[in-house]
Amino acid sequence: NQDLPVIKCVLINHKNNDSSVGKSSSYPMVSESPEDLGCALRPQSSGTVYEAAAVEVDVSASITLQVLVDAPGNISCLWVFKHSSLNCQPHFDLQNRGVVSMVILKMTETQAGEYLLFIQSEATNYTILFTVSIRNTLLYTLRRPYFRKMENQDALVCISESVPEPIVEWVLCDSQGESCKEESPAVVKKEEKVLHELFGTDIRCCARNELGRECTRLFTIDLNQTPQTTLPQLFLKVGEPLWIRCKAVHVNHGFGLTWELENKALEEGNYFEMSTYSTNRTMIRILFAFVSSVARNDTGYYTCSSSKHPSQSALVTIVEKGFINATNSSEDYEIDQYEEFCFSVRFKAYPQIRCTWTFSRKSFPCEQKGLDNGYSISKFCNHKHQPGEYIFHAENDDAQFTKMFTLNIRRKPQVLAEASASQASCFSDGYPLPSWTWKKCSDKSPNCTEEITEGVWNRKANRKVFGQWVSSSTLNMSEAIKGFLVKCCAYNSLGTSCETILLNSPGPFPFIQDNIS
């Protein structure tokens, strides 16, 4: 095998400082020193196959798989991962070796597997195989369950690749809409991995372990219903399994179901049918469309047709990586002290997000609700009318999202005063931010109506407490006012509040608080 090229396979571990996912790249970023992966010729394989040493990677770590080819002339290449081809841009290093790289940023379970690199040089063709797995750390994981067809049986297996081993249960419901809520009497739970009764209205599989509970719903089109409010859309990542169930009921068995993708019938082996008679002797048929590992070309409108029902469609969108789509511009709200109000974020995301609401360094649980139009919404109502900055944070395997909210509570100013030897200061947190007046109380002005304008210094907002602005006003002491009572008043559209201070007192000496509405 004299004319075989000299090949070197290396692993480069990166310092994690980037959250985007790159795929095939010719210029990996700054990193640690490369680790040699060997790349030995695989014996007894058809064609020339090199196999690199197995690569174990920590969750969220970033790596580059790199091949250095010492062969004359140009090379062309193609990466294949989970039946999807990824483009490949070889370049040449200073020693004129061909360099091909695959960058994996923030390693996740879905990015583990076999990466095949096909290289064509002027002399020969060959394949290089990398096997990438996630290092078995003590980190617990909880993965969203997915479905597989049971070999030689009309049944579905629910799988969740989680650590520790999760308890898997099917959650079944036979009525429509609201009555299929988790704790409803219409809901039946079966703690088993295999499900044979696949005719129900709503079928979900849930996996739970110490980290919580994750569920996946069997995506269903029901030809006996009018179409859903929005033409349904199902997102999947490259390599994930696709399952869509089409269900129809008719007075007798004389009808059939078919699946089409963009007007072309699905290939044999990508669907299977089941039928049963219901209690009232009507026939129920279900037809599953499935793809064990989706590629980009599985994107499109899937249409289920019947010889006795109107057809319905769903849009399946295959993405390279997960996403969270929402507007991240910050939002300011102004509410009354007893007004009911909730923050809300509307988003579209895949896979499903984990989220938190944070206020004053304290985190609150986050609930999300799916809307009819493919969006989800998370609301937070538990602000207890505390003004300040509220933060919504969401993340999934591939994306992160943060949105800031400011809550202002309309209220009359409340004044706090303090005095020192040289000045008197008043503070207020009313909203809208108050304006200030200072008045001198004297024999001439026992009602404190003589306004002080000299030596007053207002700061609109001198202190931000978790987003809450505090306004202050300071009066510098002068001989003219020493020994007198002075009154600072804060006023806004909701009222006025005052505090009276004796100016020759050595320490803070609030005297009388007036509340004038």
Partner: antibody, heavy 119, light 107 residues
């Protein structure tokens, strides 16, 4: 060929009800949704609702909820649209229209039925 | 509900002219949009579905484009029988909603 034939024009008093029919022929009746769309004189088109002729299930626009009912008779391949508590603003031409699929809506239309509401 | 804004509301053109009508959705509707032609006293007729697919029997001078929120109907060379009112329809979400219509008149 596909044909949707609607019932004739109607004149009704405010508060009354009207029931418009749409008879389908030239295709398998239960295989296609039927929509109802109306058009006030000189105005644009307004979607009213949809019925699944196979099961009879229907859904309506929020604006007409409680006043509109869509039904079907599979033996005669006919769909019906009944509108109650009529008002003068319900004066319009009412069309039935077939859905080829959820991706190709309203591919065949009836000729329209003029409903006039006047005291 | 999704609002469909059609423009212009009317236009005058001559036979042979290239005519463009636009439709904007208040939120993304993917490619789930159809175009209809309506002549006075007649029911609307389907021209384009799924934003750009030409209905069979419709002359090839009609074409549609766009996805998401912005859509266009183009008549490449206006014929005498094309003078009519044109409507867009979104079928992404119920209730289905039509644009306000564009009346194409003879100049």
């Amino acid at each position: 060929q596909v044909q949707l034939v609607q019932s004739g024009a109607e004149v009704k008093k405010p508060g009354a009800s009207v029931k418009v029919s749409c008879k389908a022929s030239g295709y398998t009746f239960t295989n296609y949704y039927m929509h109802w769309v109306r058009q006030a004189p000189g105005q644009g088109l307004e979607w009213m609702g949809i019925i699944n002729p196979s099961s009879g299930s229907a859904s309506y626009t929020q604006k007409l909820q409680g006043r509109v009912t869509m039904t079907r008779d599979t033996s005669t391949s006919t769909v019906y649209m009944e509108l109650s508590s009529l008002r003068s603003e319900d004066t319009a031409v009412y069309y039935c229209a077939r859905d080829r699929s959820t991706l190709v809506p309203l591919d065949y239309w009836g000729q329209g039925t003029l409903v006039t509401v006047s005291s | 509900d999704i609002q469909m804004t059609q423009s212009p509301s009317s236009l005058s053109a001559s036979v042979g002219d290239r005519v463009t009508i636009t439709c904007r959705a208040s939120q993304g509707i993917r490619s789930e949009l159809s175009w209809y032609q309506q002549k006075p006293g007649k029911a609307p007729k389907l021209l384009i579905y799924k934003a750009s697919s030409l209905e069979s029997g419709v002359p090839s001078r009609f074409s549609g484009s766009g996805s998401g929120t912005d859509f266009t109907l183009t008549i490449s060379s206006l014929q005498p029988e094309d003078f009519a009112t044109y409507y867009c329809l979104q079928h992404n979400s119920y209730p289905l909603t039509f644009g306000g219509g564009t009346k194409v008149e003879i100049k």
